[in-house]
């Protein structure tokens, strides 16, 4: 019996087609992805093959103005239209709190939404009961397939699930649910979830009875043969893991942003054992036409977005200096504003010992592309912010050693004075540079804001200590020459859309007046 698994993950609100780098589509003839194009390909496969499942491994939420405006209603609507068979909860599904998951998505989805390792307690338990499930048995042709879900247990540090959801260890939670499915004579089981490729592989290895793992969170690109675009494969598709009980378990993921449709064909014997598996992600490029009816629906929903872009989010009573002349040479108040917003967006009081889990922000000055003049009645709109942060990036959470941070700050000024983008703006950090010293030895003082303290204060950076830092995904990926961050980071979790973070902060503050306050000094 043959099953075709079509899968997406980390779509992050890319409902419309995008450029090759998953930013806003500029030249339509070269654009990729989007739900209209995805639907064309899915329907083509559904017509050609008998047993097809369309699965999503989480993080549909967050990433473009679509999510900012529609808050998840767009996810339910278009996933319903594409007739997804199941979805796993990702960490970003909790970005607007549990209510922001229940109302727009859980109550509206016509497909099961899954996670076996999230347990509700207290008053939430009855409210959310049955709205998401640990597993779902689905009819596929004349057979049944069990889908069991899982979600990163780091979600309380990455999003806003509140205090009434417990995120258990994935493997511990999955095993009894898989055992239950086996007891119920369901012998073909897919683990669908959002904990990253390393955990996907561990699940394949450790959870007895799982036949296939479909993952997300780490934006992993797997491919067999010559890759069709810019993404470099992390391994073959499917990635085969030998389980502890000796089975070959295929593990797949399909990069991110709806650029590819994962396509995996599995052959099962009559006892539900995987005999063979093969496939590849399908690049959703312009050779695949956009479905006209879905496209028309997208255009209809788009109207509200255009109106939103020009509405006032808040006011500034000071000039927001985002000029190259400032942000690439010295502390600029636009950099301070953005870093303050980044920290504010990551406030998670999950431990009595810590006022927050993260206190530090770094931001490449070259990523700040425009100032905002306060003389337009102080008004700040989404459109204004899109000029400041035009690249459609995310503000991510990483863990780095102090020694890596020191290298990053040396890199920040290694060729100071040439208006290059690597000059770092900061939050929760006090840095002093001496430019008379040779490159690589210019940081004379680097103090960081404590987290394990009731009264935050600045202490000298410790080289061997591990620190959490919020930074643009561009830096996490080694951009602007920050290779040391990419090479030495100990953990990397994708965060929220950059503009969304700043716009939410401005809306919350209502009136802003960021200052230049001595975060960056020259001796």
């Amino acid at each position: 019996w043959e099953l075709t698994i079509l899968h997406t993950n980390d779509v992050h609100s890319r409902l419309e087609q995008t450029s090759e780098d998953s930013s806003k589509c500029v030249n339509a003839s070269r654009c990729m992805g989007g739900v209209a194009r995805l639907f064309t390909k899915v329907q083509q496969i559904r017509r050609a093959e008998p047993n097809v499942l369309l699965l999503d491994a989480g993080d549909q939420y967050q990433g473009t103005i679509w999510f900012t405006v529609y808050k998840g209603a767009e996810v339910a609507h278009f996933m319903n239209a594409l007739r997804y068979d199941a979805m796993a909860l990702g960490n970003h599904e909790f970005d607007n709190g549990v209510e922001g998951l229940i109302e727009p998505l859980l109550k509206e989805a016509k497909f099961p939404i899954l996670s076996a390792n999230i347990k509700a307690k207290g008053p939430l338990a009855s409210q959310i009961s049955g709205l998401y499930l640990p597993y779902k048995v689905l009819p596929v042709g004349d057979e049944v397939v069990g889908i069991v879900g899982y979600t990163s247990k780091e979600t309380p540090f990455l999003s806003n699930p509140g205090t009434n959801l417990v995120f258990e260890d994935e493997i511990t939670a999955l095993q009894p649910e898989v055992d239950k499915l086996k007891t119920l004579n369901v012998n073909k089981i897919i683990a669908l979830g959002h904990s990253g490729f390393e955990m996907d592989k561990l699940i394949a290895q450790k959870v007895r009875g799982v036949d296939v793992v479909v993952g997300g969170h780490s934006n992993t690109f797997l491919y067999t043969g010559n890759p069709p675009s810019k993404e470099v494969p992390a391994g073959k598709y499917p990635f085969i893991v030998t389980s502890d009980d000796g089975r070959k378990v295929p593990v797949v993921q399909a990069y991110a942003f709806g650029k590819y449709l994962g396509y995996l064909k599995i052959e099962f014997d009559e006892r539900g054992n995987v005999i063979s598996s093969h496939g590849n992600p399908i690049l959703l490029n312009s050779s695949i036409p956009e479905d006209p009816s879905i496209k028309a629906d997208i255009n209809k929903w788009r109207i509200k977005l255009d109106n939103y872009s020009t509405q006032e989010l808040g006011k500034t009573i000071v000039y927001l200096d985002g000029s190259s002349q400032s942000c690439r040479f010295r502390e600029c108040n636009m950099g301070n504003l953005i870093c303050d917003a980044m920290i504010n967006n990551n406030l998670r009081h999950t431990d009595e010992m810590f006022w927050n889990h993260v206190s530090m922000c770094i931001l490449n000055g070259g990523g700040i592309r425009s100032p905002i003049d306060e003389r337009n009645n102080g008004t700040i709109t989404w459109e204004n912010l899109a000029a400041v942060l035009p690249f459609g990036g995310t503000f991510d959470l990483v863990q780095l050693k102090g020694s890596t941070l020191k290298k990053a700050f040396e890199h920040s000024v290694h060729r100071y004075g040439q208006s290059t983008g690597e000059f770092l703006q900061v939050g929760g950090i006090h840095v002093v540079y001496d430019l008379s010293r040779k490159p690589g030895d210019r940081v004379v003082k680097l103090d960081v804001l404590c987290t394990k303290c009731r009264v935050p204060s600045y202490d000298p950076l410790k080289m061997d200590e591990v620190y959490k830092v919020i930074l643009p995904n561009f830096l996490a990926n080694g951009g602007d020459g920050f290779q040391m961050i990419k090479d030495e980071l100990l953990r990397h979790d994708s965060g929220d859309q950059d503009i969304n973070v700043v716009s939410t902060y401005i809306s919350k503050m209502k009136v802003i007046y960021p200052a230049v306050e001595g975060r960056i000094k020259f001796s």
Epitope: P112, G130, Y135
Partner: nanobody, 128 residues
Framework: QRQLVESGGGLVQPGGSLRLSCAAS????????IGWFRQAPGKEREGVSC????????YYADSVKGRFTISRDNSKNTVYLQMSSLRAEDTAVYYC?????????????????????WGQGTLVTVSS
């Protein structure tokens, strides 16, 4: 081989009663949410009543509330639908369905998600 077999259908006069049975073979109904669905000629299939395996919570469509009663006898691996005060508009093929997923009875009956196991159906005709 897993099977759901419905029985008890037939011709009945308006105001009359019938009891439908759904017997399972190949799996234990204790662990399943069970539903009765019906499809009248030229109409969509609709959920009539559902019962859970765990807490025996029940759900009824508005059109049958107070007239139909769902029950289960786990020792006989059978679920029943007692239908009384039958009306002409109750005429349909009645199907039994089962889902081992922990769905709510309401989600099962709507049905919100695809249901994996179905019987062949039994015809109920209400006519004078």
């Amino acid at each position: 081989q897993r099977q759901l077999v419905e029985s008890g259908g037939g011709l009945v006069q308006p105001g009359g009663s019938l009891r439908l049975s759904c017997a399972a073979s190949g799996f234990l109904l204790d662990y399943y949410v069970i539903g009765w669905f019906r499809q009248a000629p030229g109409k969509e299939r609709e959920g009539v009543s559902c019962i859970s395996g765990s807490d025996r919570s029940t759900y009824y469509a508005d059109s049958v509330k107070g007239r139909f009663t769902i029950s289960r006898d786990n020792s006989k691996n059978t679920v029943y639908l007692q239908m009384s005060s039958l009306r002409a508009e109750d005429t349909a093929v009645y199907y039994c369905a089962a889902d081992p997923s922990p769905v709510t009875v309401q989600a099962m009956c709507l049905p919100r998600f695809p249901v994996p196991y179905w019987g062949q159906g039994t015809l109920v005709t209400v006519s004078s």
